[in-house]
Interface confidence: medium
């Protein structure tokens, strides 16, 4: 549960997390886990700890082994492991696959790509991304932060994506890779003017005075990831925020995809302890996206309760 | 600034058992390990054990195991011990304190006193 | 566990003057990574103990640059440089190397 396996290459630099969490306050001990001998905090040495992070600048292949790490709070040591293993540098392009950091998967309209491990770095932008060993180059790749941005996404662009940065510690750099494999799904989405599928419009609602009502609000916007889409409800034309009875509130649903792929919404209106006055309101359910709104209209009426002695 | 305030003076029975409550204000609740530590004037101070209100962990010193149970409700930032099977040698002031990981016992309640006695 | 010795009483000291508390420990509180895990705390009279030193070494915050703490592994020596009247009470060492913590005896510091 506490162990981590963490991977680099030879010359590069290398910085591993203690998979045991602490406070930043926390005094954070390494070893060394076969000879149980202390990891120096020294950053003179090559390889030294860091409060939660262990450092290798640069890594060199025998440094690949298991490192512990023990968290040590007021009272209580916490102890994680780190599984590092160090390679050599591959003359040929290709990646092997224990070099891969997690695949990701992107679409027309999503398909950013993390550097993975970045954050663990002190490195400044811009990032270099590269595909498949060819640098990318072009105006339909931007790198941003910590991330590469492909624009208009087709099958092709899938495939192995390296990034490269700087690390530095102390004025000195040292050079990172890191590589990951971007899928693309093939998502043919669209969008079309809303439709709502319940309420009905001009439904009645048979409420019991008192009692708890729920109205649900749910429409379809189309296949697909949708860039805006909304469901809500208004009373009397009034948004529920500013309409001001604390007893009326709104309470987003699940977003659904149901099985033909339609990206759909709920809102459900909850009526606490419904009065006579709730009868008098007009209930809208709205839908909108960018190709327009749809309205439909409830109104509720009062439900005879059972007469339990008839 | 951090402060411990804990219950009243308590006089009970042998054999009964007593809960102690410790509230924390001034802080976050659970960025410190809450420490319970008995003073008698026989044996002077005595670490009891701690909790950590984040984990939910415990930690004990052996001559206290069965004897106190620590716990803590987030909610109301209030930490208890509760000691079973009094007896006259439970007769002391406890007190809780809060430790970082450099601050060890830095912040200490008042102290409740209690007397067991038939 | 860990035994923390001091003796029960100081020698009376002179307002102004300066003041020695020791603390001897059964075994080394120095750990691998470099702490060495020695508390110093006060109990003024009716009072809770308060938090002077951390660290063997360390000065509490709020705590006045009058006491000093030093020592090897286990032989450890709290010193007051000019002691005022509010010093008074008993010092307390305690060790937070390993579970069970443990606290000394205290050694009471009076006043000529």
């Known amino acids: 549960k506490f162990s981590k396996q963490s991977w680099g290459l030879e010359n590069e630099a290398l910085i591993v997390r203690c998979p045991r969490q602490g406070k930043p306050s926390y005094t954070v001990d390494w070893y060394y886990s076969q000879t149980n001998k202390s990891i120096p905090t020294q950053e003179r040495n090559r390889v030294f700890a860091s409060g939660q992070l262990l450092k290798f600048l640069p890594a060199a292949v025998a440094d690949s082994g298991i490192y512990t790490c023990i968290v040590r709070s007021p009272t209580f040591n916490r102890t994680g492991y780190a599984n590092v293993t160090i390679y050599k540098k591959q003359s040929d392009c290709n990646v092997p696959d224990y070099l891969m950091y997690s695949t990701v998967s992107g679409s027309e309209k999503n398909s950013k790509i993390y550097c993975p491990t970045i954050d663990l770095y002190n490195w400044t932008a811009p990032l270099e991304w590269f595909k498949n060993c060819q640098a990318l180059q072009g105006s339909r790749y931007r790198a941003h932060k910590s991330f590469l941005v492909i624009d208009n996404v087709m099958t092709e662009d899938a495939g192995d994506y390296t990034c490269k940065f700087i690390h530095n510690e102390n004025g000195a750099n040292y050079s990172v890779t890191a590589t990951r494999s971007f899928t693309v799904k093939d998502e043919q989405g669209f969008s079309l003017f809303p439709v709502i599928g319940a309420p009905a419009q001009n439904e009645i609602k048979e409420v019991e005075i008192g009692k708890n009502a729920n109205l649900t609000c749910s429409a379809c916007f189309g296949k697909g990831t949708q860039f805006l889409a909304a469901v809500l409800w208004q009373l009397n034309g009034t948004k529920i925020t500013d309409f001001g009875e604390p007893r009326i509130q709104q309470e987003e649903g699940q977003n659904q995809s149901f099985s033909n792929g339609l990206a759909c919404l709920d809102m459900v209106l909850r009526i606490a302890d419904v009065k006579e006055e709730d009868l008098l309101l007009q209930y809208d359910c709205l839908a909108l996206n960018l190709h327009g709104l749809r309205r439909h209209t409830v109104r509720l009426s009062r439900k005879n309760p059972i007469d339990h002695h008839s | 600034q951090v402060q411990l305030q804990q219950s009243g003076a308590e006089l009970v029975r042998p054999g009964a058992s007593v809960t102690l409550s410790c509230k924390a204000s001034?802080?976050?609740?659970?960025?410190?390990?809450m420490q319970w530590v008995k003073q008698t004037p026989v044996h002077g101070l005595e670490w009891i054990g701690a909790?950590?209100?984040?984990?939910?962990?415990?930690a004990y010193n052996q001559k206290f195991k069965g004897k106190a149970t620590l716990t803590a409700d987030k909610s109301s930032s209030t930490a208890y011990m509760e000691l079973s099977s009094l007896t006259s040698e439970d007769s002391a002031v406890y007190y809780c304190?809060?430790?970082?990981?450099?601050?060890?016992?830095?912040?200490w309640g008042q102290g409740t006193s209690l007397t067991v006695s038939s | 566990d860990v035994v923390m010795t001091q003796t029960a009483f100081s020698n009376p000291v002179t307002l102004g003057t300066s003041a020695s508390i020791s603390c001897r420990s059964s075994?080394?509180?120095?750990?691998?990574?470099?702490?060495?895990?020695l508390y110093w705390y006060l109990q003024k009279p009716g009072q809770s103990p308060q938090l002077l030193i951390y660290?063997?070494?360390n000065l509490a915050s709020g705590v006045p640059d009058r006491f000093s703490s030093s020592g090897s592994g286990t032989d450890f020596t709290l010193r007051i440089s000019r002691v005022e009247a509010e010093d008074v009470g008993v010092y307390y060492c305690?060790?937070?190397?390993?579970?069970?913590?443990?606290f000394g005896s205290g050694t009471k510091l009076e006043i000529k």
């Open positions: 304190s809060g430790s970082t990981t450099d601050y060890y016992f830095a912040y």
């Open positions: 001034g802080h976050i609740f659970t960025d410190y390990e």
């Open positions: 909790f950590d209100p984040e984990t939910g962990d415990t």
């Open positions: 075994k080394s509180l120095l750990h691998s990574n470099g702490i060495i895990y």
């Open positions: 660290q063997m070494s």
């Open positions: 305690a060790q937070n190397l390993e579970l069970p913590f443990t």
